[in-house]
């Protein structure tokens, strides 16, 4: 799997999980989240060469098509596969509120 | 939706569905499929600017991150959203066999 265990251990130009820390205030302009101040969002990036972690029949076909037609621009792309939620604390006035924001953290990637 | 109805009607540099006809023999080197000779596989391509059809909370956050941090390389990518199967006819010896290949045709795209 193109997850932290594999990607953060290997120098990999191909599609892989990349570390990215987002500071809510500095990077998003969000002052409304009290805790955490930021989080490890991560992101997916890298080349998708022939059959590198292709996740669908279509991406495998496209991968093969590109190998046979190298001038083609129709190549698969490195995107998130597994995502996890992030629990945040914010205030509605003086009242603290805990909320789980879905699909905030990328755990693994795929070529799609 | 970034589907044929929208994308094939508009000239769109941003992430959109693109037409792609794949000839099994010529483009994939597959001689084993008897019918059809090829099919409209389509593919997704184009830029994913600020919040263009972002499909998850993470891709929206990443989009906002990129706007505030334009030097960042952590941008969403244009990939397939809805896929459909393709029914094919092939032969096992002299015996015709009909098979449905899943996720062969891209119907719409998203920034992920």
């Amino acid at each position: 799997a193109l997850d932290a265990a594999y990607c953060f251990r290997n120098v990999q130009d191909n599609c892989c999980l990349r570390p990215l820390y987002i500071d809510f205030k500095r990077d998003l302009g969000w002052k409304w989240i009290h805790e955490p101040k930021g989080y490890n969002a991560n992101f997916c990036a890298g080349a998708c060469p022939y059959l590198w972690s292709s996740d669908t029949q279509h991406s495998r076909v496209l991968s093969l098509y590109n190998t046979i037609n190298p001038e083609a621009s129709a190549s698969p792309c490195c995107v998130s596969q597994d995502l996890e939620p992030l629990t945040i604390l914010y205030y509605i006035g003086k009242t603290p509120k805990i909320e789980q924001l879905s699909n905030m953290i990328v755990k693994s990637c795929k070529c799609s | 939706a970034l589907d044929a109805a929208y994308c094939f009607r508009n000239v769109q540099d941003n992430c959109c569905l693109r037409p792609l006809y794949i000839d099994f023999k010529r483009d994939l080197g597959w001689k084993w499929i008897h019918e059809p000779k090829g099919y409209n596989a389509n593919f997704c391509a184009g830029a994913c600017p600020y919040l263009w059809s972002s499909d998850t909370q993470h891709s929206r956050v990443l989009s906002l991150y990129n706007t505030i941090n334009p030097e960042a390389s952590a941008s969403p990518c244009c990939v397939s959203q809805d896929l459909e199967p393709l029914t094919i006819l092939y032969y096992i010896g002299k015996t015709p066999k009909i098979e449905q290949l899943s996720n062969m045709i891209v119907k719409s795209c998203k920034c992920s």
């Epitope: 998003l28 302009g29 205030y91 509605i92 006035g93 003086k94 909320e99 924001l101 | 909370q57």
Partner: antibody, heavy 120, light 108 residues
Framework: DVQLVESGGDLVKPGGSLRLTCVAS????????MHWVRQAPGKGLQWVAY????????YYADSVKGRFTISIDNSKNTLYLQMNSLKTEDTATYYC?????????????WGQGTLVTVSS | DIVMTQSPGSLAGSPGQQVTMNCRAS???????LAWYQQKPGQHPELLIY???SRAPGVPDRFSGSGSGTDFTLTISNLQAEDVANYYC?????????FGQGTKLEIK
């Protein structure tokens, strides 16, 4: 320069529907919580609803809950207020406003307002 | 809901004079959950004071806010003709946000 421009106000019959639009410019739209506030003719200000961009957390005043829907198109820098089952007491000038940063906060920029008249 | 009560309902002052208006909350807001707005005739509200005493950018220092708990005051010194407006207090300590009914300021 920060600008908020509302539109969509009209004369509508009781029970009717209307959609108000607020287009923002001059700042990173998705960084600030957005509110709708209304003002009946000759009266004071009444808060209607808020939405947190990107995460789409919304909250409503009891008087409009179940009838009004606040939404946002982050990519178009646009805030909406879908108003259904309108009542005569919904007659007001509707303002969109942005907060200083917190969910409930002072509102540092306001639109010019759009007038909604509910009358038979 | 927190009820905000403003007094007086209206007041008149002479140019150059100092005027004060009050805002009382039905329960304690703490020290920083109150804002003041100015609304000139036919215009949208404009933020004057937030956090009970912090002036919004571009607001003249003739405007000042004070108070904590349930009692807050807006003071306008060196009154000008352009200060004719309705003034509203707003609490944001608790949901829903609520506003006072307003104080109408006129120039003698």
């Amino acid at each position: 320069d920060v600008q908020l421009v509302e539109s969509g106000g009209d004369l509508v019959k009781p029970g009717g529907s209307l959609r108000l639009t607020c287009v923002a410019s001059g700042y990173t739209f998705s960084s600030n919580v957005m509110h709708w506030v209304r003002q009946a003719p000759g009266k004071g200000l009444q808060w209607v609803a808020y939405v947190i961009p990107i995460v789409d957390i919304a909250y409503y005043a009891d008087s409009v809950k179940g009838r009004f829907t606040i939404s946002i198109d982050n990519s178009k820098n646009t805030l909406y207020l879908q108003m259904n089952s309108l009542k005569t007491e919904d007659t007001a000038t509707y303002y969109c406003a942005r907060t200083l940063g917190l969910v409930l906060d002072a509102m540092d920029y306001w639109g010019q307002g759009t007038l909604v008249t509910v009358s038979s | 809901d927190i009820v905000m009560t403003q007094s007086p309902g209206s007041l008149a002052g002479s140019p150059g004079q100092q005027v004060t208006m009050n805002c009382r909350a039905s329960q304690s807001l703490g020290s920083s959950y109150l804002a003041w707005y100015q609304q000139k005739p036919g215009q949208h509200p404009e933020l004057l004071i937030y956090g009970a005493s912090s002036r919004a950018p571009g607001v003249p220092d003739r405007f000042s806010g004070s108070g904590s708990g349930t009692d807050f005051t807006l003071t306008i010194s060196n009154l000008q003709a352009e200060d004719v407006a309705n003034y509203y207090c707003q609490q944001y300590a608790d949901s829903p946000i609520t506003f006072g009914q307003g104080t109408k300021l006129e120039i003698k």
